[in-house]
């Protein structure tokens, strides 16, 4: 396993609707044609996977059906978005690369990007 | 190193707007966040809100909401805080400060006086 | 929103003792979103703490936070003579983040 230099943002402001959207950029020692990347999440010294995807260079991102993640790619860098945030999801979100194909295998992990997460103000009742 | 620097010293008349300036340097300005915070004299500090640099989303305090705009220019790393409709108790010093991984502002602007006074 | 209550408002202490600042939060706040400054008169806050108790860089290790849920202190383990200042603690927990209403450690 070689180590990888992996870099994102240091914090970014979700959207109203609880959108994120940040690039994790990665510097490929050589051309990785299928390449892993994971989201994790840190809180409160608690890391748990967010969602994960294996995609061959070129070709889009495939997350699974159910999951908060989107992305793109485009060379060394993955686009990733995160929808669906709440205020509880506010926490330290961790870009993992691993290039799987072809050998050597390489690891990055970046220092992770702070999502923090505002709940939209409730609409105040209206009277017609 | 990080350094960030603050516009000078303004004085406004009630009902009038003021626009401080925070330009950075030393690091990927897009990476991080700015926020503003406010001292009147002799009082404590007021968080005013922030801005992502890297997206332009703003979460600003409700106090505020309405009178104040966050913006930031990513081609002169500067960030900017506009205070519209200024009273006399909108004198303060203005601080801009970095909004990094832990959220905590471990750099911060000079500060910047604004006297609002007919 | 969150309000931040410090006590005591005023600590007289002479250099060389041991402060005990304490921050007690209207809501329970997540230790990683809590911070602690310093400031001096004329000057830009300092951050000293952040995550409740990691010291920031270049803070000497006589500043200590700890602290969870609602209570939460900053130690000054031996004043010394630049120390002298008011100390504020801030939640990024729930927005809007706020600050307590501060601390001043003075000279005795």
């Known amino acids: 396993c070689k180590a990888m230099h992996v870099a994102q943002p240091a914090v970014v402001l979700a959207s109203s609707r609880g959108i994120a959207s940040f690039v994790c950029e990665y510097a490929s020692p050589g051309k990785a044609t299928e390449v892993r990347v994971t989201v994790l999440r840190q809180a409160d010294s608690q890391v748990t996977e967010v969602c994960a995807a294996t995609y061959m260079m070129g070709n889009e991102l495939t997350f699974l059906d159910d999951s908060i993640c989107t992305g793109t790619s485009s060379g060394n860098q993955v686009n990733l978005t995160i929808q669906g945030l709440r205020a509880m999801d506010t926490g330290l979100y961790i870009c993992k690369v691993e290039l799987m194909y072809p050998p050597p295998y390489y690891l990055g992990i970046g220092n992770g990007t702070q999502i923090y997460v505002i709940d939209p103000e409730p609409c105040p009742d209206s009277d017609f | 190193q990080v350094q960030l620097v603050q516009s000078g010293a303004e004085v406004k008349k009630p009902g009038a707007s003021v626009k401080v300036s925070c330009k950075a340097s030393g690091y990927t300005f897009n990476s991080y966040g700015i926020s503003w915070v406010r001292q009147a004299p002799g009082q404590g500090l007021e968080w005013m809100g922030w801005i992502s640099a890297y997206n332009g989303n703003t979460n600003y305090a409700q106090k505020l909401q309405g009178r104040v705009t966050m913006t930031t220019d990513t081609s002169t790393s500067t960030a900017y805080m506009e205070l519209r409709s200024l009273r006399s108790d909108d004198t303060a010093v203005y601080f801009c400060?970095?909004?990094?991984?832990?959220?905590?502002?471990?750099?911060w602007g000079q500060g910047t006086l604004v006297t609002v006074s007919s | 929103e969150i309000v931040l209550t410090q006590s005591p408002g005023t600590l007289s202490l002479s250099p060389g003792e041991r402060a005990t600042l304490s921050c007690r939060a209207s809501q329970s706040v997540s230790s990683s979103y809590l911070a602690w400054y310093q400031q001096k008169p004329g000057q830009a806050p300092r951050l000293l703490i952040y995550?409740?108790?990691s010291r920031a860089t270049g803070i000497p290790d006589r500043f200590s936070g700890s602290g969870s849920g609602t209570d939460f202190t900053l130690t000054i383990s031996r004043l010394e003579p630049e120390d002298f200042a008011v100390y504020y603690c801030?939640?990024?927990?729930?927005?809007?983040?706020?600050f307590g209403q501060g601390t001043k450690v003075e000279i005795k």
């Open positions: 801030q939640q990024f927990g729930s927005s809007p983040w706020t």
């Open positions: 400060a970095r909004v990094g991984r832990h959220l905590a502002f471990a750099y």
């Open positions: 995550g409740a108790s």
